[in-house]
């Protein structure tokens, strides 16, 4: 009886040992397969990310091309309209002019006296810039650089007047402290009669013969 039990126990031990061994093999196989699956998943993820990135870049490029195309189209139709128009108002801003809130602006890089700058703008069917708001002031300041720059404001004929007839008294102003001082010490038969943006954007009145930069402004046809 005893030997029979011992035999059965031995048989059970062998069976269990085999079972453990085969289970271990299967667990290892499953683990290995799991690792492969994980790696495959990661690979698929990175491929997906790359494709997404490529698609996003292609989309950005496409958007850019569409925007450029629309801009070119608008510019072309604008120039065609300008050819048919009488030239009294701009249907679009000329090359090298900047558009802002329905007006076109040209920023000089050289220096001229106020009268010469005024004449230059008129020959371009424009006028020296008239500042109507804080926002327009900021736009001009951003583009003009840290250099004294003439604007279309003068008191050569008495009171301060904007060249386009905009009312000075009720309009936007941005003078430096103590300005305008209409300094008469220069003996030019009048005070400092022309206004300019200083390097920090605030306004000063100065002798009109100074060789400062200037900004021309022209209204754009609101219909386009």
């Amino acid at each position: 009886q005893n030997s029979k039990l011992r035999g059965e126990l031995q048989a059970l031990r062998e069976t269990f040992s085999n079972f453990t061994a085969s289970t271990e093999v299967e667990v290892k196989a499953l683990s290995s397969q799991g690792g492969n699956v994980g790696r495959k998943m990661k690979s698929l993820e990175s491929q997906l990310e790359k494709q997404q990135k490529d698609l996003s870049e292609d989309h950005s490029d496409l958007l850019l091309h569409v925007k450029q195309f629309v801009s070119d189209l608008r510019s072309l139709s604008c120039q065609i309209a300008a050819l048919h128009g009488n030239g009294s108002t701009l249907t679009c801003c000329p090359v090298n002019w900047l558009e802002y809130e329905g007006s076109c602006y040209w920023f000089s890089r050289s220096g001229k006296s106020w009268p010469e700058a005024d004449k230059y703008c008129q020959l371009e069917s424009a006028h020296l810039v008239v500042v109507n708001s804080r926002e327009e002031q900021k736009f001009i300041q951003h583009h003009m650089g840290p250099v004294n720059t003439w604007m279309g404001l003068t008191d050569q004929s008495g009171p301060w007047k904007w060249v386009d007839g905009t009312d000075y008294e009720t309009g936007f102003k941005n003078w430096r402290p103590e300005q305008p001082d209409d300094w008469y010490g220069h003996g030019l038969g009048g005070g400092e009669d022309c206004a300019h943006f200083t390097d920090d954007g605030r306004w000063n009145d100065d002798v009109c013969q100074r060789p400062y930069r200037w900004v021309c402004e022209a209204a754009r046809d609101p219909a386009t």
Epitope: G111, P146, V147, G185, G189, V207, Q209, R210
Partner: antibody
């Protein structure tokens, strides 16, 4: 300290060319306008040319217009004066000078000068 | 071009004297007038700008005044180192122009 050093002067025949240089140090060169001023032997000072801080504006005395060209290289802190079709009356000491501002504010610092002699 | 006329063209003075040099312009130049000092064989030195503003490092014995077309440079008490030639210059507009110079000599 702020310093301007001219070079390139010498003896040259009428009709020939010469290029003067002015090396700047001790200040932010690209923020200032620069001038050339000359002085003929025994005579007073004569302004020659100006170039604005960024090279955008250049102005010349009538006596050199069309013959002289002022230029600058802000990356090298150097000012130049290219002198073509030189004449006897161009004989002078040439000074480079710094503008107090971007190019329309008068002169505050001067170099020691370089001598140009135009003679056959 | 704006013409600059300096007077006198030369003057003799003694140490301690008060000296005044005049500069007249052919048209008004605002406040855009400068004065320079030049000694023989040396580069000009900036003394004053905007009519009366002293360049840094320049002693207060130098002063400038004037308006319109008439300007003056004053040396309150002449010292040995002040014997030199003095030039005025306008920088209101291009071309910049200089006066003919005033030579200050020892009496």
């Amino acid at each position: 300290q702020v310093q301007l050093v001219e070079s390139g002067g010498g003896v040259v025949q009428p009709g020939r060319s010469l290029r003067l240089s002015c090396a700047a140090s001790g200040f932010t060169f690209s923020s200032y306008g620069m001038h050339w001023v000359r002085q003929a032997p025994g005579k007073g000072l004569e302004w020659v040319a100006v170039i604005w801080y960024d090279g955008s504006n250049k102005n010349y005395a009538d006596s050199v217009k069309g013959r002289f060209t002022i230029s600058r290289d802000n990356s090298k802190n150097t000012l130049y004066l290219q002198m073509n079709s030189l004449r006897a009356e161009d004989t002078a000491v040439y000074y480079c000078a710094r503008d107090q501002g971007v190019g329309y504010d008068g002169l505050d610092v001067w170099g020691q000068g370089t001598t140009v002699t135009v003679s056959s | 071009d704006i013409q600059m006329t300096q007077s006198p063209s030369s003057l003799s003075a003694s140490v301690g004297d008060r000296v005044t040099i005049t500069c007249r312009t052919s048209q008004g130049i605002g406040k855009y007038l400068a004065w320079f000092q030049q000694k023989p064989g040396k580069a000009p030195k900036s003394l004053l700008y905007k009519v009366s503003s002293l360049q840094s490092g320049v002693p207060s014995k130098f002063s400038g005044s004037g308006s319109g077309t008439d300007f003056t440079l004053t040396i309150s008490s002449l010292q040995p180192e002040d014997f030199a030639t003095y030039y005025c210059q306008q920088y209101m507009t291009y071309p910049l122009t200089f006066g003919g110079g005033t030579k200050v000599e020892i009496k």
